[in-house]
C-alpha cells in the first residue's frame, strides 16, 4: 500500500488517521528532501492532484483542508517541486479512512438449529460503519456465573458442547471499532426454548380430479421433536397476499395437506415450523410451485425445473424455486 513507500518527509492527519465521516480534516505535508527547498508542495488523493484549500505554512510544510470529508477510504500522498528537478519528488503517503462508531447492537437472537450442534447468535448491527468493526458476544451462565466471550465480525456459531454451565444463560453483544464502542441489552435464554426443528420441506403436490378438485401437498421434516406447530402459506403467483394454514404436526410420517384451489392457476407454497409453544420459527422453506390443471389431474414433484403436461393421472412437473424478497429467512 501507500504506507510502504520510502518517505522524504512526513504526511499526517488532524485529528487522526481514521475519523468520523463528515468531519472537517487537515492533512499536513512536511518535506525533508536533501538539497531541496520546495518551490511548491502538492497533494494527491487517490492519484488525483488537489487544487484547492492548500495553504503553505512555512518553507517545508503545507496543509490541505477538507470540509465534510465523506469518503470511506482515500490514499493520500504529497510531492515537492524542487529546483533543478525535472519531476516532482515524492515526500510521503498515507491511507486515511472515515466512518462511524457502531450503533448499539439490538434484536439479539440466539437459536439452536436441530442437529447443528451449534447455538447461532445474530443481531441487528445498525448503520454501516464503513470501517473494520468487531463484535464480542458474551455468554454468561446464570447457574455457574461463568462467562465466555467470542470475537466475530458478524454472527457467531457457538458449539453447544462448550455450553457446560447448565441451560440458562445471559447473552449480550459488544460492538467496537476505532471510533467507538457500544453494548446491547442482555438477552436471557434457556437452551431448551430456542431449538428450531429440522427444516420442513415440501416434496410434491398432487391435484385429484374429484367433484371438487383438491390439491394435496406432501411435506416432511427429519425432526425428532414430538410437538411441532407448522404454518403453510400459499398464494397465486399473481397475488400479493398469502393465505396461511396452521397445523399441529407429528412427523412420524409424511404430512399431507389438502387445499381447494382455483383451476389453471400457478400457486406457490412455503412451510415453516416451530416447537409448539416456543418462540422461534424456522425460516420459510424454498418456494414450491404448483399449477392446478384445467380439468386434468396433475402431480408436481421436486425433481424437475420446467412444466410438463400430460393427460395421464399423475404427471411430474416443476417444483422448486428460490428465495425471493417476500420469502425472507426470518426466525423471529
Amino acid at each position: 500500500g501507500i504506507t510502504n513507500i520510502n518517505c522524504s518527509g512526513h504526511i499526517w492527519v488532524e485529528p487522526a488517521t481514521i475519523f468520523k465521516m463528515g468531519m472537517n480534516i487537515s492533512i499536513y505535508c512536511q518535506a525533508a528532501i536533501k538539497n531541496c527547498q520546495p518551490r511548491k508542495l502538492h497533494f494527491y488523493k487517490n492519484g488525483i492532484k488537489e487544487r484547492f484549500q492548500i495553504t503553505r505554512i512555512n518553507k517545508t510544510t503545507a496543509r490541505l483542508w477538507y470540509k465534510n470529508f465523506l469518503e470511506p477510504h482515500a490514499s493520500m500522498y504529497c510531492t515537492a517541486e524542487c529546483p533543478k528537478h525535472f519531476q516532482e519528488t515524492l515526500i510521503c503517503g498515507k491511507d486515511i479512512s472515515s466512518g462511524y462508531p457502531p450503533d448499539i447492537p439490538d434484536e439479539v437472537t440466539c437459536v439452536i438449529y436441530e442437529y447443528s450442534g451449534n447455538m447461532t447468535c445474530t443481531w441487528n448491527a445498525g448503520k454501516l460503519t464503513y470501517i473494520d468493526t468487531k463484535y464480542v458476544v458474551h455468554v454468561k451462565s446464570l447457574e455457574t456465573e461463568e462467562e465466555q466471550q467470542y470475537l466475530t465480525s458478524s454472527y457467531i456459531n457457538i458449539s453447544t458442547d462448550s455450553l457446560q454451565g447448565g441451560k440458562k444463560y445471559l447473552v449480550w453483544v459488544q460492538a467496537a471499532n476505532a471510533l467507538g464502542m457500544e453494548e446491547s441489552k442482555q438477552l436471557q435464554i434457556h437452551l431448551d426454548d430456542i431449538v428450531i426443528p429440522s427444516a420442513a420441506v415440501i416434496s410434491r403436490a398432487e391435484t385429484i380430479n374429484a367433484t371438487v378438485p383438491k390439491t394435496i401437498i406432501y411435506w416432511d421434516s427429519q425432526t425428532t421433536i414430538e410437538k411441532v406447530s407448522c404454518e403453510m402459506r400459499y398464494k397465486a403467483t399473481t397475488n400479493q397476499t398469502w393465505n396461511v394454514k396452521e397445523f399441529d404436526t407429528n412427523f412420524t410420517y409424511v404430512q399431507q395437506s389438502e387445499f381447494y384451489l382455483e383451476p389453471n392457476i400457478k400457486y406457490v407454497f412455503q412451510v415453516r415450523c416451530q416447537e409448539t409453544g416456543k418462540r422461534y420459527w424456522q425460516p420459510w422453506s424454498s418456494l414450491f410451485f404448483h399449477k392446478t390443471p384445467e380439468t386434468v389431474p396433475q402431480v408436481t414433484s421436486k425433481a424437475f425445473q420446467h412444466d410438463t403436461w400430460n393427460s395421464g393421472l399423475t404427471v411430474a412437473s416443476i417444483s422448486t424455486g428460490h428465495l425471493t424478497s417476500d420469502n425472507r429467512g426470518d426466525i423471529g
Epitope: T3, H10, W12, V13, E14, P15, A16, T17, I18, F19, K20, M23, N24, I25, S26, Y28, Q30, I57, N58, T61, R63, W65, D95, D132, K134, A178, L179
Partner: antibody, heavy 117, light 107 residues
Framework: QVQLVQSGAEVKKPGSSVKVSCKAS????????ISWVRQAPGQGLEWMGW????????NYAQKFQGRVTITADESTSTAYMELSSLRSEDTAVYYC??????????WGQGTLVTVSS | DIQMTQSPSSLSASVGDRVTITCRAS??????LNWYQQKPGKAPKLLIY???SLQSGVPSRFSGSGSGTDFTLTISSLQPEDFATYYC?????????FGQGTKVEIK
C-alpha cells in the same frame, strides 16, 4: 521556539464550570491544532478533545461530549477549554498540547483544577 | 475506542542498563504511535513520533520500533535523567488514547 502558557490554578465547587486558557507564542497559531489532555492525581493521561485553530473544527472524546467546549481565538493566539457540571473526579491537571506530526510536540505547563465543596 | 496496554507498569533498572518498554494496541494502528516521557510535576515530553522517528533534541539512546499492534520503546543505556514515567499514545483514531504508563525507577 513554540511556547504554550496556561492560566493559573483554580478551585471550583461541584456543579460549576471552569475555563482554562492556553496562549501560544513562537509559532503560527493558525497552522496547527490544539488538544487538551488531563491527568488526575497519580493517574495517567486522558485526551479530552481537539480544535483546529484556523478552522474552528472540534472533536471531543465521547466521555466529555456535552460537558466540554474547546474554542480558539486566532487574534490572541489563545485556545480555551471549558468544562461544565464539575464533579470531584474532575480534579486534575489540565494540559494543552500542540498537534504536530500527529503527536503532541509542545505542551503547556499544566493548570491544576481542584473541585471541592 | 482503541485501548493501549503498556508493560511492565513499573521497572527497576540501573544506570547503563538497556531498558525496553512495550505497548500493545487493541487493534492495528499502523505506525501511528508516539512515546512521551513525564517527570513528576512536569508536562509530558515527546520522545518518538510515528513509531520510530526521534523527535528533534531527544538523545539517540531512545529508539522506537513496531507497527500494527505491537510497539517498543528502547533506552539503550539508561542515564540518571531518564528515571521517569513513559507513556505510549495512539494517533490513529479519536479518541486519542494513552497507555497507562511505565514507571522507570532506580534499582
Amino acid at each position: 521556539q513554540v511556547q504554550l502558557v496556561q492560566s493559573g490554578a483554580e478551585v471550583k465547587k461541584p456543579g460549576s464550570s471552569v475555563k482554562v486558557s492556553c496562549k501560544a507564542s513562537g509559532g503560527t497559531f493558525s497552522s496547527y491544532g490544539i488538544s487538551w489532555v488531563r491527568q488526575a492525581p497519580g493517574q495517567g493521561l486522558e485526551w479530552m478533545g481537539w480544535i483546529s485553530a484556523i478552522f474552528g473544527t472540534t472533536n471531543y472524546a465521547q466521555k466529555f461530549q456535552g460537558r466540554v467546549t474547546i474554542t480558539a481565538d486566532e487574534s490572541t493566539s489563545t485556545a480555551y477549554m471549558e468544562l461544565s457540571s464539575l464533579r470531584s473526579e474532575d480534579t486534575a491537571v489540565y494540559y494543552c498540547a500542540r498537534h504536530w506530526l500527529q503527536s503532541f510536540d509542545y505542551w503547556g505547563q499544566g493548570t491544576l483544577v481542584t473541585v471541592s465543596s | 475506542d482503541i485501548q493501549m496496554t503498556q508493560s511492565p507498569s513499573s521497572l527497576s533498572a540501573s544506570v547503563g542498563d538497556r531498558v525496553t518498554i512495550t505497548c500493545r494496541a487493541s487493534q492495528s494502528i499502523g505506525g501511528d504511535l508516539n512515546w512521551y516521557q513525564q517527570k513528576p510535576g512536569k508536562a509530558p515530553k515527546l520522545l518518538i513520533y510515528a513509531a520510530s522517528s526521534l523527535q528533534s533534541g531527544v538523545p539517540s539512546r531512545f529508539s522506537g520500533s513496531g507497527s500494527g499492534t505491537d510497539f517498543t520503546l528502547t533506552i539503550s543505556s539508561l542515564q540518571p535523567e531518564d528515571f521517569a514515567t513513559y507513556y505510549c499514545q495512539q494517533s490513529y483514531s479519536t479518541p486519542l488514547t494513552f497507555g497507562q504508563g511505565t514507571k522507570v525507577e532506580i534499582k
